[in-house]
């Protein structure tokens, strides 16, 4: 049956036993800015091109050992649930990896800079549709990396991001606290924020949405027909860059200041249970959760 | 995320050091009265002291990034530090990484078409 | 253009083994693995396993266990299958194709197992 | 893991339209998205005709097309044309591999 996480994203009108919209977000290529990936995993395999790109620290620590299944373990889930054939949001989106993240996860401002550079040079060089950029990573408030992340939005490309797993306010977190971002809180299968150990999702006003975060069934790069369920804010901006991917497939000329209308129009509103949030961040934090349109161009959609 | 709201630096530090005038044979001369500013990440363990990235004004040019790294390069090479110019940006913003002494800061945000310099920071897999 | 270029075919005694290669061009290789599929005579095709270009990483079929290893070397774009202790129904066409979902075929490989 | 249930031959004269039904379990066609079907020719290597359920591959003339329904797919080739007759498979994921029907012999009449 249907995983919890895309029957919530799913238009009541749409849901049957399966959710299969097979050419989703075909027209539009989604770059993803972290660990190393599995491409050849069964769920994903040619959908993902692997970029020449790589800027990420060395590993913390002198008895680490790099096992290729752990340093591939995040990306590879997420561009599963980009796209993945059978647990993907956007089943027809072509995607292209950087890794600007470690074995560790661990990545730096400066990668993650060089790594958007590279991605708008691409953009230079071959323009091609619409593109969007997911970055399922956080780190302090830093003004360079939200000035990258601005003048890449300028440039027309959709940037959605973690809003972060810290339990606190995003703002004080970039890239979500960039305001041309598309920041996306995590919530679970009771439409309650997710809590990840003594920490959860980060609120506030610069996070712009909500989408599911809890328990995504993924694929794993244990093995290459493997699937994991995974939790985190980076899950909940996977789905969202599907939905923008779906949505810039259907609509190309949409601006982001219109996606991201879209985005909020479309979301389920006031269902997350607002108790959780610290009190003076409830009237701050914006009560919504992801869903793709009930579209009346039903084709536009699922194609 | 979320549009339509001032930036909120939040606990974010910011150093701005006055630019003095010092002979350093600068060609070109900041403006008078602007301030190149500092930042770094508020949060200790994720700071990343020793990598910094120049980020120069905006229309600054390729050739003139790459002759502001030098710059700083020689004026640190002549106080008997070394650096190294670990990347040069253009495309998104004007500017280049540098890995050098944070003692060279205050004579780096002297420089020429520099807006501000950020120390490095790490970012994390959410 | 996509290609898959498979061996010749090769005639062997019950018992021995066989290796059949193929030269993936035309993709990137660590996008996609490469599966091994075989057609014994006048019957259908068998999925037999599939090896990983990126990290030499294998998924074999059950009734292949213990008896066929499947491998790659990226830097000459080639995949291998072998399979020992050949008994008289391994014989058949033997066919290399790109990743999971087989979109593209190699041109198949016979072998005959006979004493 | 048993092969998936295809009928052995079916036919039908040029310009009919046929279907080919390929019947497996819930844990390969009713649990995935991912099933496929091959023409192969005598003598020839199979060609993918259809992929992941309804997608047809560029170069794949829109005779052929793919459906599903609960733990059953189907290909119908619409406009029956005399260069269609070959044998078809079926073909999907299973959990942790894959599995081919038995074969159908199509024969243009």
């Known amino acids: 049956s249907i995983p919890w996480n895309l029957e919530r994203i799913t238009p009541p009108r749409y849901r049957a036993d399966e959710y299969q919209p097979p050419d989703g977000g075909s027209l539009v290529e989604v770059y993803l800015l972290d660990t190393s990936i599995q491409s050849d995993h069964r769920e994903i395999e040619g959908r993902v091109m692997v970029t020449d790109f790589e800027n990420v620290p060395e590993e913390d620590g002198t008895r680490f050992h790099r096992q290729a299944s752990k340093c591939d373990s995040h990306g590879t889930h997420l561009a599963g649930v980009v796209s993945g054939r059978d647990a993907g949001v956007a089943k027809g989106a072509s995607m292209r990896s950087l890794r600007v993240l470690n074995c560790q996860g661990k990545g730096t401002v400066s990668g993650t800079l060089i790594g958007l550079e590279f991605i708008r040079k691409s953009q230079l060089v071959q323009p091609v549709g619409p593109l969007v950029v997911l970055l399922p990573l956080a780190g302090g408030y830093s003004r360079v990396l939200n000035a990258a992340c601005q003048r890449l939005a300028r440039a027309g490309v959709v940037l959605v991001t973690a809003a972060g797993n810290f339990r606190d306010d995003a703002c004080l977190y970039s890239p979500a606290s960039a305001p041309e971002v598309i920041t996306v809180g995590a919530t679970n299968a009771q439409d309650q924020p997710v809590t990840l150990g003594t920490l959860g999702t980060n609120f506030g006003r610069c996070v712009d949405l909500f989408a599911p975060g809890e328990d995504i069934i993924g694929a794993s790069s244990d093995c290459s027909t493997c699937f994991v369920s995974q939790s985190g804010t980076s899950q909940a901006a996977a789905h969202v860059a599907g939905i923008a991917a779906m949505m810039l497939s259907a609509e190309p000329e949409l601006t982001l200041a219109e996606l991201r209308q879209r985005l909020i129009h479309f979301s389920a509103k006031d269902v997350i249970n607002e108790a959780w949030f610290p009190e003076d961040q409830r009237v701050l934090t914006p009560n919504l959760v992801a869903a793709l349109p009930p579209s009346t161009h039903e084709n536009l959609y699922f194609q | 995320g979320a549009m339509g709201q001032e930036d909120e630096d939040g606990d974010y530090e910011e150093l701005v050091l006055a630019l003095r005038s010092e002979e350093d044979g600068l060609a070109e001369a900041p403006e008078h009265g602007t301030t190149a500013t500092f930042h770094r990440c508020a949060k200790d363990p994720w700071r990343l002291p020793g990598t910094y990235v120049v980020v120069l004004k905006e229309e600054t040019h390729l050739s003139q990034s790459e002759r502001t790294a030098r710059r700083l390069q020689a004026q640190a090479a002549r106080r008997g530090y070394l650096t190294k110019i670990l990347h040069v940006f253009h495309g998104l913003l004007p500017g280049f990484l540098v890995k050098m002494s944070g003692d060279l800061l205050e004579l780096a945000l002297k420089l020429p078409h520099v807006d501000y310099i950020e120390e490095d920071s790490s970012v994390f897999a959410q | 253009e996509v290609q898959l270029v498979q061996s010749g075919a090769e005639v062997k005694k019950p018992g021995a083994s066989v290796k059949v290669s193929c030269k993936a061009s035309?993709?990137?290789?660590?996008?996609?693995?490469i599966s091994w599929v075989r057609q014994a005579p006048g019957q259908g095709l068998e999925w037999m396993g599939w090896?990983?270009?990126?990290?030499?990483?294998?998924n074999y079929a059950q009734k292949l266990q213990g008896r066929g290893t499947m491998t790659t070397d990226p830097s000459t774009s080639t995949a291998y299958m072998e399979l020992r202790s050949l008994r008289s129904d391994d014989t058949a066409v033997y066919y290399c194709?790109?990743?999971?979902?087989?979109?593209?075929w190699g041109q198949g490989t016979t072998v005959t197992v006979s004493s | 893991e048993s092969a998936l249930t295809q009928p052995a031959s079916v036919s039908g004269s040029p310009g009919q339209s046929i279907t080919i039904s390929c019947t497996g379990t819930?844990?390969?066609?009713?649990?995935?998205?991912?099933v496929s079907w091959y023409q192969q020719h005598p003598g020839k290597a199979p060609k993918l005709m259809i992929y992941?359920?309804?997608n047809r591959p560029s170069g794949v003339s829109n005779r052929f097309s793919g459906s599903k329904s609960g733990n059953t797919a189907s290909l119908t080739i619409s406009g029956l044309q005399a260069e269609d007759e070959a044998d078809y498979y079926c073909?999907?994921?299973?959990?942790?591999?894959?599995?081919f029907g038995g074969g159908t012999k199509l024969t243009v009449l």
């Open positions: 194709a790109r990743g999971y979902g087989m979109d593209v």
């Open positions: 035309g993709y990137t290789l660590t996008s996609y693995g």
């Open positions: 090896v990983s270009f990126y990290n030499g990483n294998t």
């Open positions: 819930s844990s390969d066609v009713g649990g995935y998205n991912s």
């Open positions: 992941e359920v309804s």
């Open positions: 073909n999907s994921y299973t959990s942790t591999s894959m599995v």
